[in-house]
Interface confidence: low
Amino acid sequence: YDFTNCDFEKIKAAYLSTISKDLITYMSGTKSTEFNNTVSCSNRPHCLTEIQSLTFNPTAGCASLAKEMFAMKTKAALAIWCPGYSETQINATQAMKKARKSKVTTNKCLEQVSQLQGLWRRFNRPLLKQQGSSDYKDDDDKHHHHHH
């Protein structure tokens, strides 16, 4: 799915109001320095691509994120604010239902959600340019294009 045409400000509002808090709840009891962020993103569509992948694609050691509260709210936000997104997810959702058996919070899942927090942070504030300051100056932003 191409996230270029999403309403990024609406998704950001959803993140700030609820998704961020659900991620914190999931990570409660985990030190913020426990995991190193290894996944990054350079612009908002790229961030959403990585967020969707980490949230909904089962990985080795963590197959159980898709039914978490933050994941359901992420899915809802993408479905509402990204044109055509929900249609692309129907088959994926069916596969997910079959794959899911029980809820287990593994260390691998905690690490994955820590990566998600980093991606959301970057999405929320990709570059200073996002604030629309007339004084904006950027000395090395060669490859980061932002779509509003």
């Epitope: 980093g118 504030r125 200073l128």
Partner: antibody, heavy 121, light 105 residues
Framework: EVQLVQSGAEVKKPGASVKVSCKAS????????MNWVRQAPGQRLEWMGI????????SYNQKFKGRVTITRDTSASTAYMELSSLRSEDTAVYYC??????????????WGQGTTVTVSS | EIVLTQSPATLSLSPGERATLSCRAS?????MHWYQQKPGQAPRPLIY???NLASGIPARFSGSGSGTDYTLTISRLEPEDFAVYYC????????FGGGTKVEIK
Amino acid sequence: EVQLVQSGAEVKKPGASVKVSCKASGYTFTDDYMNWVRQAPGQRLEWMGIISPYNGGTSYNQKFKGRVTITRDTSASTAYMELSSLRSEDTAVYYCAREDYDYDGYAMDHWGQGTTVTVSS
Amino acid sequence: EIVLTQSPATLSLSPGERATLSCRASSSVSYMHWYQQKPGQAPRPLIYATSNLASGIPARFSGSGSGTDYTLTISRLEPEDFAVYYCQQWSSNRTFGGGTKVEIK
């Protein structure tokens, strides 16, 4: 533990420039903005400008436009604020303040200890 | 530029009393942050995004408001609460209020 350590006090003559440094540790320097805020004796806090260490983007308070330049050295995890054409009313304590975007509205959650700049002939 | 006006400029109260500090914006803002500053020290975050307590801040501090009017409340003043309090907004660049000094009566 997040720490912002600023350079020492400076005494400058009117018309000169001053460059204050702010060394960050305890977090990934490029992950958050860095603000510069000053406070003249007995006065309110005054925002001067901001830099995104991630890409070097800057935004300045119009009051200081043309006189203030904020830069960063990512390899040293250090932000700099240079103020030129100093006048006596620039005598103040200058703070760097990290801005965390996890909070709605981008809050300044950690502050340097402050650098006193005195402008006097 | 959004101008933040804090009132009163000085609040004279006794320990144990309730303090209500006001911050009014010249136009609507999304959120307000509050900081505490003691003489010779850097500001310390108190309240993030209108109503969220910063780390290590006791529950006697609370924030509320929306639009142009925001309030910081200290339910029962402790001796260490006597300081200057600043509000700060982000909606248009960043600006601080003029501060409210809470002093011992």
